[in-house]
């Protein structure tokens, strides 16, 4: 039986290419270490966008070169994906793993459809 | 029962606030005069965005002050809504009426969710 993970159905990226959404998991007990992965689904293909492991005491930490940032509060994770372009429009799935202590649990959300519109270029200043 | 009307589920407005989609109706016979209405649904409320009557021979013509433009080809109508802002994000329903000759037919699509993102203002040129 998988762990329930909830995420919004649709999110619009800002005109600067930034999209934020909350990923909430059904906490089963007192997980001390949680891993959150954002996957992009295209057809039957899944590609990893970013991932982070955090402990309940510490802040959520993505790698420095990651397109994602995030904060956590209890069983909610606030995820932000940056640098999005129109071609990045798609379904982004939040995967949550309760890593430690045992038992291990994993759950995946139904995905958040992120829509991205490329901004019009600003006119050149004369 | 009733005439079938098809329209896309989702459309993104451009950064200039322009959204286009095709509304296609299941033509029953030889309608010479067709009326197309775009309605915006908010809750149980429907408000008319724009409407136009066209004859199969002529081009689709919206009122001069309308936020919509359109072209028609057979039983397909290409609709464009302009001047959209983020607050206009919502469900836009295409209603098609075969007005003349009798019999009268009416059909409504399931709606197109139009997402609109306001652009970032361009920096002032010094």
């Amino acid at each position: 039986k998988g762990m329930h993970v909830a995420q919004p159905a649709v999110v619009l990226a800002s005109s600067r290419g930034v999209a934020s959404f909350v990923c909430e998991y059904g906490s089963s007990g007192n997980a001390a270490e949680v891993r959150v992965t954002v996957l992009r689904q295209a057809g039957s293909q899944m590609t990893e966008v970013c991932a982070a492991t955090y402990t309940v005491e510490d802040e959520l930490a993505f790698l420095d070169d990651s397109t994602c940032t995030g904060t956590s509060s209890g069983n909610k994770v606030n995820l932000t994906i940056q640098g999005l372009r129109a071609m990045d429009t798609g379904l982004y799935i939040c995967k949550v793993e309760l890593m430690y202590p045992p038992p291990y649990y994993v759950g995946m959300g139904n995905g958040t459809q992120i829509y991205v519109i490329d901004p019009e270029p600003c006119p050149d200043s004369d | 029962k009733g005439m079938h009307v098809a329209q896309p589920a989702v459309v993104l407005a451009s950064s200039r606030g322009v959204a286009s989609f095709v509304c296609e109706y299941g033509s029953s016979g030889n309608a010479a005069e067709v009326r197309v209405t775009v309605l915006r649904q908010a809750g149980s409320q429907m408000t008319e965005v724009c409407a136009a009557t066209y004859t199969v021979e002529d081009e689709l013509a919206f009122l001069d002050d309308s936020t919509c433009t359109g072209t028609s080809s057979g039983n397909k109508v290409n609709l464009t809504i302009q001047g959209l802002r983020a607050m206009d994000t919502g469900l836009y329903i295409c209603k098609v009426e075969l007005m003349y000759p009798p019999p009268y037919y009416v059909g409504m699509g399931n709606g197109t969710q139009i997402y609109v993102i306001d652009p970032e203002p361009c920096p002032d040129s010094d």
Epitope: - | K1, G2, E33, A51, Y100, P101, Y105, V106
Partner: antibody, heavy 114, light 112 residues
Framework: EVQLVETGGDLMKPGGSLRLSCVAS????????MSWVRQAPEKGLQLVAG????????YYTDAVKGRFTISRDNAKNTLYLQMNSLRDEDTAVYYC???????WGQGTLVTVSS | QPVLTQPPSVSAALGQRVTISCTGT?????????VQWYQQFPGRPPKTIIY???NRPSGVPDRFSASTSGTTATLTISGLQAEDEANYYC???????????FGSGTQLTILG
């Protein structure tokens, strides 16, 4: 507010002629095809004639073909029904109706009797 | 002679639900042609309450609904109010007559 106001109904002798008018307001008249519907006590409701928005095409029920003429003047927002060779069975209240059945006028009574 | 058959009268109590049937043939209601329903008070013009089988014009309360099955169309009025007492007519296109056909009307009486 949409309004359709019919005028011209009268008491006529069989064989006579009459012209009904319907002045429209509150909507873009030139964008809508229009119809005349009549209601006689013994015959119920009947769509008599229809016309497209531009006035270039018309439709008539068999009972009035060759006797009635539907026309419109979009500049005056007015729909007409010219009724010739009137018969007893044309006695009815005549309503002006938008062709999608959305609005009806209040009606005008035409009585044909010798 | 009306082509669509309606009961001459129906009655129901305030707050109750009532249905009015409109039976046609394969060349009209059963042929997939849109059905309209009209409400008429004495001395007044008809008012369309349902168009295109089940659509309500703006201003018509959602107590009025309609459906079609086979050659019969049905108007349902729920939560009856005193002001619903009126004549109700149905209409549809008839393909063999190439004309609109109407029902003879149903007088709705509110009891109590």
């Amino acid at each position: 507010e949409v309004q359709l106001v019919e005028t011209g109904g009268d008491l006529m002798k069989p064989g006579g002629s009459l012209r009904l008018s319907c002045v429209a307001s509150g909507f873009t008249f030139s964008s809508y095809s229009m119809s005349w519907v009549r209601q006689a006590p013994e015959k119920g409701l009947q769509l008599v004639a229809g016309i497209n928005s531009g006035g270039s095409s018309t439709y008539y029920t068999d009972a009035v073909k060759g006797r009635f003429t539907i026309s419109r003047d979009n500049a005056k927002n007015t729909l007409y029904l010219q009724m010739n060779s009137l018969r007893d069975e044309d006695t009815a209240v005549y309503y002006c109706v938008i062709s999608n059945w959305s609005y009806w006028g209040q009606g005008t009574l035409v009585t044909v009797s010798s | 002679q009306p082509v669509l058959t309606q009961p001459p009268s129906v009655s129901a109590a305030l707050g109750q639900r009532v249905t009015i049937s409109c039976t046609g043939t394969a060349t009209n209601v059963g042929g997939g042609y849109d059905v309209q329903w009209y409400q008429q008070f004495p001395g007044r013009p008809p008012k369309t309450i349902i168009y295109g089988n089940y659509n309500r014009p703006s201003g018509v309360p959602d107590r009025f609904s309609a459906s079609t099955s086979g050659t019969t169309a049905t108007l349902t009025i729920s939560g009856l109010q005193a002001e619903d007492e009126a004549n109700y007519y149905c209409s549809s296109w008839d393909n063999s007559l190439t004309a609109y056909v109407f029902g003879s009307g149903t007088q709705l009486t509110i009891l109590g």
